[in-house]
Interface confidence: low
């Protein structure tokens, strides 16, 4: 008996060939003897079978001793032995139907899980396997289980289900929801604008929400929310912005806030978090605020920075062309009586400049110039 | 499929309105943007502007800013573009377009020639 | 308003050679990692086609004898080898910032 493995929603064709190269007399009929259809000359004929509607033939075919049952948007209960009857002789085509689905939703947030379900026919065992778009390989039965859904798991997951050494294959599109960044840093000058940028992960086209931006300064007791705003589509519409900092926000996706100016009371770090229609759950992006002043007070050279640093950031002071006077591994350095000349205040990784202030030391009758 | 069928051509004098419409089916209206663009005669082609259906906001190029009014009507799945005060030198094929998978657009329909003559 | 210049103006090619179109943006259209330019196809008569969209990504449908590449600000449409049918203009089309702009067209025509 020839088995054929069929996708739920798919059309199939089941062949059936006479071995006389012209078109005769043919039938097909389910496990139940019920006819499907057949001919009568060269018309086409259907039986009282639940297929009715969704049963067909090529009649381009018959000429050619071909009679094919075609069956459309199948059914798990389409499952069944289909017996055609031609020349004297039964052909027997065992027909098994089998269907793939998330059994939530295909856009999943970050770090949610993702339930595969197969449904099968009575009587069958099929085994699966998938293969995620970033190339990892799970297997199971009737159900497959993924915890904690990864930015890398959107795309195609390729499942293939197999049974009697035959296979099948099911794509399913899953979409993470995430930010690109699950968390980004900002090195700024004080006085300079400030541009904080939350770009998405994936794109969907209706895409509506609420979110909030907390930020918790380095120099205060407690976070506070800076911003709260709604998302309609493409579209932002700002709730509530605090007077001081007073940010902008950007009406179109991606997110984007710009703050006004660069100061040390606001260096530190924030959370923003995203939450879409319809889904459990937040999205989170952190973002940091690192903040530099060089100032000159009477004899003392000092170069600051606030926020988030990482210990192995080093704050240089030096005069220009010249060798750093002073480096160090804090968030401090001065220089007492500096001479005159454009002096650089410089927070380095690993050698690369992320933050350069410059300060012109005038001879000391003057007054500092800060370019 | 997707498809978005322009309302027929139309010759106007100047000074004049014109309304043209983009009847979209084949996908959910409110879930994609409605762009319009138009084309003079051997010449490039030009954003007019956006609309999003489902909210019904609409954002436009500022060189039509004040002429242009663009909306949409969700019950019948038809985006409208209305340009006033019509020059001759608005004479073009208007058409309408839709987004695809990417950035691109994808659809378009088959394009509304506006002849503004006196 | 970002603008956009193409070059050539027109451009005439033997079937099975290359064709290659270039688009160059006032200000940069990238955008985290992604350039939002895309490029279209016009035969006379008809609404644009999308061939490409986010400088590099074919659209469903199109043959792969069309390319494009670059970021920032210059890009570039390929076209190899080219075929009797591809004679048309081909537009670019920044979707980076309104007002959305495209360029002034190539008119390719097959010798």
């Known amino acids: 008996k020839k088995v054929v493995l069929g996708k739920k929603g798919d059309t199939v064709e089941l062949t059936c060939t006479a071995s006389q190269k012209k078109s005769i007399q043919f039938h097909w009929k389910n496990s139940n003897q019920i006819k499907i259809l057949g001919n009568q000359g060269s018309f086409l004929t259907k039986g009282p079978s639940k297929l009715n509607d969704r049963a067909d033939s090529r009649r381009s075919l018959w000429d050619q001793g071909n009679f094919p049952l075609i069956i459309k948007n199948l059914k798990i209960e389409d499952s069944d032995t289909y017996i055609c009857e031609v020349e004297d002789q039964k052909e027997e085509v065992q027909l098994l139907v089998f269907g793939l689905t998330a059994n939530s939703d295909t856009h999943l947030l970050q770090g949610q899980s993702l339930t595969l379900t197969l449904e099968s026919p009575p009587g069958s065992s099929p085994s699966v396997q998938c293969r995620s778009p970033r190339g990892k390989n799970i297997q199971g039965g009737k159900t497959l289980s993924v915890s904690q859904l990864e930015l890398q798991d959107s795309g195609t997951w390729t499942c293939t289900v197999l049974q009697n050494q035959k296979k099948v294959e099911f794509k399913i599109d899953i979409v993470v929801l995430a930010f690109q960044k699950a968390s980004s840093i900002v090195y700024k000058k004080e006085g300079e604008q400030v541009e904080f940028s939350f770009p998405l992960a994936f794109t969907v086209e209706k895409l509506t929400g609420s979110g909030e931006l907390w930020w918790q300064a380095e120099r205060a007791s407690s976070s506070k929310s800076w911003i709260t705003f709604d998302l309609k589509n493409k579209e932002v519409s700002v709730k509530r912005v605090t007077q001081d900092p007073k940010l902008q926000m950007g009406k179109k996706l991606p997110l984007h806030l710009t703050l006004p100016q660069a100061l040390p009371q606001y260096a530190g770090s924030g959370n923003l978090t995203l939450a879409l229609e319809a889904k459990t759950g937040k999205l989170h992006q952190e973002v940091n605020l690192v903040v530099m002043r060089a100032t000159q007070l009477q004899k003392n050279l000092t170069c600051e920075v606030w926020g988030p640093t990482s210990p192995k950031l080093m704050l240089s002071l030096k005069l220009e062309n010249k060798e750093a006077k002073v480096s160090k591994r804090e968030k401090a350095v001065w220089v007492l009586n500096p001479e005159a000349g454009m002096w650089q205040c410089l927070l380095s990784d690993s050698g690369q400049v992320l933050l350069e202030s410059n300060i012109k030391v005038l001879p000391t009758w003057s007054t500092p110039v800060q370019p | 499929q997707v498809q978005l069928v322009q309302s027929g051509a139309e010759v106007k004098k100047p000074g004049a309105s014109v309304k043209v419409s983009c009847k979209a089916s084949?996908?959910?209206?409110?879930?994609?943007?409605i762009h319009w663009v138009r084309q003079a005669t051997g010449q490039g082609l030009e954003w007019i502007g956006e609309i999003y259906p489902g909210s019904g906001s609409a954002y436009s190029n500022s060189k039509f800013k004040d002429r242009v009014t663009i909306t949409a009507d969700k019950s019948t799945n038809t985006a409208y573009m209305e340009l006033r005060s019509l020059r001759s030198d608005d004479t073009a094929v208007y058409f309408c377009?839709?987004?695809?998978?990417?950035?691109?657009?994808?659809?378009w329909g088959q394009g509304t020639l506006v002849t503004v003559s006196s | 308003d970002i603008v956009l210049t193409q070059s050539p103006a027109s451009l005439a090619v033997s079937p099975g050679q290359r064709a290659t179109i270039t688009c160059k943006a006032g200000?940069?259209?990238?955008?985290?990692?992604?350039?939002?330019m895309n490029w279209y196809q016009q035969k006379p008569g008809q609404p644009p086609k999308l061939l490409i969209y986010v400088a590099s990504n074919l659209e469903s449908g199109i043959p792969s004898r069309f390319s494009g590449s670059g970021s920032g600000t210059d890009f570039t449409l390929t076209i190899n080898p080219v075929e009797e049918n591809d004679t048309a203009t081909y537009y670019c089309q920044q979707s980076y910032k309104d007002p959305l702009a495209f360029g002034p067209g190539t008119k390719v025509e097959i010798k």
């Open positions: 377009a839709r987004r695809g998978n990417g950035t691109g657009f994808a659809y």
């Open positions: 200000q940069s259209v990238d955008y985290d990692g992604d350039s939002y």
């Open positions: 084949g996908y959910t209206f409110t879930d994609y943007v």
